[in-house]
């Protein structure tokens, strides 16, 4: 009886794993083996495919073959018993184009209200992604084990920290890689779960802000308790994108080591031009907090984005606010050559209830005020460019009294 050629050959490539699967054409014939040949583009001769000769199953692995992953190849298969079937040719393909990104490796660390996720490619030193290793981005799905409500986080790098979680709670997540340059989305990792720790005695510092004063940077933060010491560290932001690096060598800011106030001042020349991450930690001598949320600090923008200056014209039921360019030391106005949006906060002097106005214009009306009442106003500028999502610190508050009634015109 003539042997029929195998049919429906599928090529699965995940990272550097090359797997072939096919269907037997004739299930009734026993003890059949299968063999593959391959042919590179521009070659006439066929070469035996190592790892895929005289196979008794319907699956074989040819990962050991050192192929140029960007070069098109052709495969053919036949069945063998006493005689052989005719060859069945598989459509030619380019391994790189066909390849899928495998599940990444995931490593989790827990804090009380945060989880640190370290992600690395599933295949170390992959040949398939050798030219693209630095271009991997990752996305993840995270959920509370008890609720199952999923949250997606896109475009993260090899280390990511998720904040604002609950203590003593199990969170589960899965991660997949993407190569946006090649329009490739990977396979999800297995699900990893970790339980956050008991709540730490000391919370981390919050609301870290950087401003510029004269030739110095001023770093301020909020803290719950008094009589603490703080340390501040920095890291080049680009290091977060380095997939092979899981040792982030955070460095101390010398003038911000063991400071006893919730701010520290250090010279601008501590940092060369660039984008940095900053973090703050608190200690009371016995206990240490976890690190604060990391803030991004761009020396270029920080140097320019100063708080706005403004004048107030007071009426009985409103303020007219005129925003001008901020002043540098020496009272020269700063030229801001990118669009800004202004956030104006105002409140009655005797109350803590703040109201907010966001405005693109430089003349702003604050309406619905009471006559003969002292109101305070502070303002800050934000860049409108999403990529440079920066904010100045707030200006000092300016307090003015509204006029008596009937002066609104």
């Amino acid at each position: 009886k003539n042997l029929k050629s195998p049919q429906k050959v599928e090529v699965d490539i995940i990272d550097d794993n090359f797997i072939l699967r096919w269907n037997r054409s004739d299930e009734s014939v026993g003890n059949v083996t299968f063999s593959f040949d391959y042919q590179k583009t521009g070659m006439d001769n066929w070469i035996k495919l190592s790892g895929c000769q005289n196979i008794t199953s319907t699956k074989c692995n040819f990962s050991s073959l050192k192929l140029n992953v960007y070069e098109e190849i052709k495969l053919r298969i036949r069945a063998e018993k006493e005689n052989t079937s005719s060859w069945y040719e598989v459509d030619s393909f380019t391994p790189f184009r066909k390849a899928q990104i495998g599940p990444p490796e995931v490593h989790l660390e827990a804090e009380d209200k945060a989880i640190v996720i370290h992600i690395s490619p599933g295949t170390k030193d992959s040949v398939m992604w050798a030219l693209d290793g630095l271009s991997f981005t990752y996305s993840l799905v995270i959920w509370k084990n008890s609720s199952g409500v999923e949250e997606r986080i896109e475009n993260i790098y090899s280390r990511h920290k998720i904040y604002k979680l609950s203590p003593e709670t199990t969170y589960c997540l899965k991660v997949k890689a993407a190569l946006l340059t090649s329009w490739k989305i990977g396979v999800y990792s297995p699900v990893h779960c970790i339980k956050t720790t008991v709540e730490n005695e000391l919370p981390p510092p919050e609301n870290i802000e950087v401003s510029v004063q004269n030739q110095n940077y001023v770093l301020k933060w909020d803290y719950t308790y008094a009589n603490m010491t703080f340390q501040v560290q920095w890291l080049h932001a680009f290091l977060k994108r380095n997939p092979g690096n899981h040792l982030y060598k955070w460095k101390q800011i010398p003038d911000c080591e063991n400071v006893k106030t919730t701010q520290c001042v250090f010279p601008q020349n501590v940092f060369q031009k660039g984008i940095y991450l900053l973090r703050v930690q608190a200690s009371d001598g016995n206990n240490t907090s976890f690190w604060s949320e990391e803030i991004k600090f761009d020396t270029e923008i920080q140097a320019f984005l100063l708080p706005p200056v403004f004048n107030i014209r007071s009426l009985s039921d409103s303020f007219h606010i005129y925003i001008g360019a901020p002043k540098q030391s020496g009272n020269t106005p700063v030229i801001q050559d990118y669009p800004l949006i202004y956030e104006i906060i105002f409140w009655e002097n005797t109350s803590n209830a703040e109201r907010k106005i966001i405005e693109k214009k430089t003349d702003v009306t604050v309406p619905n005020l009471k006559p003969l009442t002292v109101y305070c106003v502070k303002a800050r500028a934000h860049t409108m460019d999403e990529k440079l999502n920066k904010s100045s610190v707030f200006s000092d508050a300016v307090c003015e009294k509204t006029k008596p009634g009937n002066t609104s015109k």
């Epitope: 490593h107 989790l108 660390e109 827990a110 804090e111 009380d112 640190v116 370290h118 970790i194 720790t197 008991v198 730490n200 005695e201 690096n245 899981h246 040792l247 982030y248 060598k249 460095k251 101390q252 200690s283 016995n286 206990n287 240490t288 976890f290």
Partner: antibody
């Protein structure tokens, strides 16, 4: 493969200094921290400090501050620890270890025995 | 400094026994805890990092668990080569510290 090879045993007099070396191979020393740990005979492990060989930034345990100096020569993949004003209780084995992010101290040197005796 | 205590300080066990060693830290260290094994006259050997991850080449009978201030090393079925001293280690904040050790010997 990854290896940390430490210098040989030393005998020193009280008050003297000793400089120990830890030669790394199989990895780039600049990508890691090198830690030093001491162990007295029959006792536990005690952390002395660490160096970042890339920029020579150090952290020392307060107990050793002022008496220990850690340095590194990346051109020969070697970290050093110098301990001054030696006392008889410095008669211990000193270990160097490689530290890499969440992997912590993953590889150790074989140890160097320092004997302080008059 | 973060203090670390280990219990028991020593234990006698037989081959095949399940052995559990606990480690307590004086403050919350997240999951920044590692475990080492040391045999007399030898350098420490790294077993576990980040509380529960085994280093490559470490047998699966070794496992770690815990978080915050309470950590555990478990040897599911003690083998003859496991008789040694075990140390926990925190690398959450400087100065890094070690537990005093737990000596596991043959019953």
């Amino acid at each position: 493969q990854v290896q940390l090879v430490q210098s040989g045993a030393e005998v020193k007099k009280p008050g003297a200094s000793v400089k120990l070396s830890c030669k790394a191979s199989g990895f780039n020393i600049k990508d890691y921290y090198i830690h030093w740990v001491k162990q007295a005979p029959g006792q536990g492990l005690e952390w002395i400090g660490r160096i970042d060989p890339e920029d020579a930034e150090t952290k020392y345990a307060p107990k050793f501050q002022g008496r220990v100096t850690m340095t590194a020569d990346t051109s020969i993949s070697t970290a050093y620890m110098e301990l001054s004003r030696l006392r008889s209780d410095d008669t211990v084995v000193y270990y160097c270890g490689r530290y890499h992010g969440y992997w912590a101290l993953d590889y150790w040197g074989q140890g160097t025995l320092v004997t302080v005796s008059s | 400094d973060i203090q670390m205590t280990q219990s028991p300080s020593s234990l006698s066990a037989s081959v095949g026994d399940r052995v559990t060693i606990t480690c307590k830290t004086s403050q919350n260290v997240g999951t920044n805890v590692a475990w080492f094994q040391q045999k007399p006259g030898k350098a420490p050997k790294s077993l576990i990092y980040s509380t529960s991850y085994r280093y490559s080449g470490v047998p699966s009978r070794f496992s770690g668990s815990g978080s915050g201030t309470d950590f555990t090393l478990t040897i599911s079925s003690l083998q003859p080569e496991d008789f040694a001293t075990y140390y926990c280690h925190q690398y959450f904040s400087y100065p890094y510290t070690f537990g005093p050790g737990t000596k596991v010997d043959i019953k």
